[in-house]
């Protein structure tokens, strides 16, 4: 029959090659000459040429040694054709199974494996898993079946069998109690992997087991008693550093100390923190100590670790005796910050207030006073009594020195101790407003058209406080009311300025008097630029031929003509004419275009 059973070929065959494996035979060879061929991976496709066939005999040939670890099975097709090339059989499956030889040693996946386990753990605790691979077959043979074992352990303390390894999984576990990091921090195991399930080739590797720290050592004070001297009143003063030793891993939570004051600090005067580098307890004052109240404190300090203890351990306690040293204390102003109401503008020499300090020391010390900071130089202070008087004019509206009606002064008290000490106090003068400022309009320069002019709204400001401000009243003075009107709005905080008669293009002064609710009057001159235009304007259109200064000049054009015609004499004429024109400016403007202005205003 045109069938071939699976062919088993051992890997790593010695040859000689080509090696005959099996003969393909078609029973059609009785009728015609048959030519045989094979196809498939290993024959005519990669890896080409592993197998061949003798075309006329049908012998299947192996051309080279096989490697099961590279290709474990080849699937080929056998073909039979007659002399004329016609196929005489269907393609036949040829299975070539490569059988395994134990040609590979086990290989550990790492040269060195690293694992860790907590000190003091119970036997049976898993540490780590090691792995060795073997490329040989582990399904049909034992060639690739790996068995693990521990060859040696270093050090052999407390004895030489602290660990075991599972022969098939490679899991390393603790087998004995007594792991103590403080005695043996690390074990080095030489491990073996042997194929043929322990009867074949062996390879070795190293497993390093780190013993992890458990908090099985309490911190201990060295020494246990401390004595310290601290000046009174100092906050944040380092009183004492307390030192501990701990056998656990430095800088770990099991080593880092946590300190607590467990007695002797009823007034909550002290705090203790852990120094991050030295692990010492740094005892400092949280509040100033008062020698006069208590000259000695006996503190009890307990130490634990950041991490809880892994086993039951005693807690260490230290005693710190703190002696308070007397110091000359500074006088203290009562209150430290004093608020006084005083009217602005009071006469020089007028008393403002008395501001005194007390000395905490038991001795009756003499206190003298002086002003430390008085930005405007408005005050003086009696050195003996602490009486504060005005020596300058207190001005609430002085924005350089006064903020939100308050003028701030710093005063100093000095005792006569040895050495003398000083204390400061803050005097906050709340200045009461008086009506010492009149209202002022903003802006003080306007530009307006002389035809269909737009009303100019000016804001009114008054530096004083209510009721010395709005409502305001407005009045035009110095004949300004001939050409202008000024009206205060309903709210009384703006004034509306309007041009009521035609004025030629020029600059004019409008005299505006404003008074506040307390009848404080303020005269302001508004500079009005009148332009030849209609409605709203920002700047005058066209070439500006405005006059000079407050009066302005109406004779610019004439002056130019006169200069052209007469030369030197023209200068004198121009001066004369200019002066006359300037004086008669408002009258000339009125006569010139009275008719046109009349039409505009009526419109």
């Amino acid at each position: 029959d045109w069938v071939v059973a699976p062919i088993s070929v051992p890997e790593n065959g010695k040859g000689p090659f080509p090696q005959r494996l099996n003969q393909l035979k078609s029973n059609k060879d009785r009728d015609t000459k048959i030519f045989y061929s094979i196809t498939g991976p290993g024959a005519d496709s990669p890896p080409e040429g592993v197998f061949a066939v003798e075309k006329e005999t049908g012998w299947l040939l192996l051309n080279k040694p096989l490697d099961r670890e590279e290709i474990a099975k080849y699937e080929l097709f056998g073909h039979a054709v007659s002399e004329n090339g016609a196929s005489v059989e269907d393609p036949m499956n040829i299975s070539i199974i490569v059988t395994d030889q134990n040609d590979h040693k086990p290989k550990f996946t790492q040269d060195t494996f690293r694992g860790s386990v907590l000190e003091g753990v119970l036997p049976g605790t898993s540490v780590m898993q090691v792995t060795a691979t073997d490329e040989d077959d582990a399904i049909y043979t034992y060639n690739g079946v790996v068995a693990y074992s521990i060859h040696s352990q270093e050090p052999k303390d407390p004895h030489d069998l602290m660990f075991t390894i599972h022969r098939s999984t490679g899991t390393i576990s603790v087998i004995s109690s007594g792991l103590d990091r403080e005695k043996v921090p690390e074990y080095t195991l030489t491990i073996q992997a042997t194929d043929m399930d322990g009867d074949g080739s062996t390879t070795t590797a190293v497993a390093v087991v780190e013993i992890l720290d458990a908090n099985d050592n309490a911190p201990m004070f060295e020494p246990q008693k401390y004595e310290a001297w601290v000046p009174e009143n100092e906050v944040g003063h380092e009183v004492q550093r307390l030192t501990v030793t701990d056998l656990d891993v430095p800088n770990s939570p099991a080593w880092r100390a946590t300190y607590h004051i467990v007695g002797g600090d009823d007034g909550d005067h002290f705090t203790i923190t852990t120094h991050p580098e030295t692990n010492q307890g740094v005892l400092t004052t949280k509040k100033g100590l008062d020698f006069e109240a208590q000259d000695q404190h006996t503190l009890y300090v307990e130490v634990t670790n950041e991490a809880p203890f892994a086993v039951k351990l005693p807690t260490a306690t230290a005693t710190v005796v703190v002696h308070v040293k007397d110091v000359n204390e500074a006088p203290v102003f009562v209150p430290p910050s004093k608020v006084v109401e005083v009217q602005e503008g009071i006469p020089t020499g007028e008393p403002v207030c008395v501001y005194t300090a007390e000395d905490p020391d038991k001795e009756n010390q003499k206190i003298s006073y002086r002003i430390l900071r008085d930005p405007a130089g408005w005050l003086a202070m009696d050195p003996d009594s602490g009486q504060v008087t005005a020596v300058g004019t207190l001005d609430r509206e002085d924005e350089q020195f006064v903020r939100n009606n308050i003028y701030e002064v710093m005063v100093l008290a000095m005792d006569n101790g040895s050495p003398p000490t000083t204390g400061t106090g803050t005097l906050l003068l709340t200045l009461i407003d008086v009506n010492d400022h009149g209202p002022v309009p903003e802006p003080r320069q306007i530009t307006i058209c002389n035809q269909s002019p737009v009303r100019q709204v000016l804001n009114i400001t008054d530096k004083d406080l209510s009721p010395h401000t709005s409502p305001f009243q407005a009045q035009l003075t110095d004949d300004s009311d001939i050409y202008w009107t000024a009206e205060v709005n309903e709210e009384g905080d703006t004034v509306v300025l309007s041009l009521k008669k035609f004025l030629k293009q020029d600059t004019y002064d409008v005299h505006l008097s404003l008074s506040d609710h307390g009848n404080k009057e303020q005269l302001t001159v508004i500079r009005a630029t009148v332009c030849d235009c209609h409605g709203h304007v920002e700047t005058c259109p066209g070439p500006w031929k405005g006059g000079s200064g407050g009066g302005g000049s109406g004779a610019g054009v004439i002056a130019v003509i006169v200069v052209v015609v007469i030369a030197i004499v023209a200068g004198i004429v121009v001066l004369v004419i200019s002066r006359k024109k300037r004086m008669a400016k408002y009258e000339k403007a009125e006569i010139k275009e009275m008719g046109e202005m009349h039409r505009e205003l009526n419109a």
């Epitope: 030519f35 075309k55 006329e56 080279k64």
Partner: antibody, heavy 121, light 107 residues
Amino acid sequence: VQLVEESGPELVKPGASVKISCKASGYAFSSSWMNWVKQRPGKGLEWIGRIYPGDGETKYNGKFKGKATLTADKSSSTAYMQLSSLTSEDSAVYFCARQRDYGALYAMDYWGQGTSVTVSS
Amino acid sequence: ELVMTQSPASLSASVGETVTITCRASDDIYSYLAWYQQKQGKSPQLLVYNAKTLAEGVPSRFSGSGSGTQFSLKINSLQPEDFGTYYCQNHYVTPFTFGAGTKLEIK
């Protein structure tokens, strides 16, 4: 065993074709592979391809696919190689060489005397 | 394509001397290596196949060795008729490839 390349030296024009023959005697022609090898003047040997006359199976060097066509006539025990679209690069001596069938892994044990092909206009 | 590297490219020797020619394959060809001798204007002649088997009628002063990728042809006691060009050839995988040749000349 004897391989005789019967066609004498060939002088052909570029673009033309030439067919070289190789007559075998002294062995079973249809049961051995016939190889063809090219040698340019002063150069080494270059394998073109082979044919198994028994069933006409061919195998070519990729470089000569489309250039060389191998055929065999069992009745006259003659192998042929046709070279097409000739250029000056095809000017060479062409050898036929027998290879016994042993899974086609045998060396070429008998060689023809060679046919010289010159391509020139 | 498998590359065959032959060395030396040329070699001068005297009659009676022993010479060795080497051939390196770019991949494993096991023992499938042949050596040929070609004289000027003649066709190549098979000397050795399967790396070390001498072809019929080849004198025993010729010997082949090697396997895998490294091969050599040794000629003991050179004779005048041994001068010519020698080629190695892979007869394992197609395309069959030849070395570039070693030209052996009389010193």
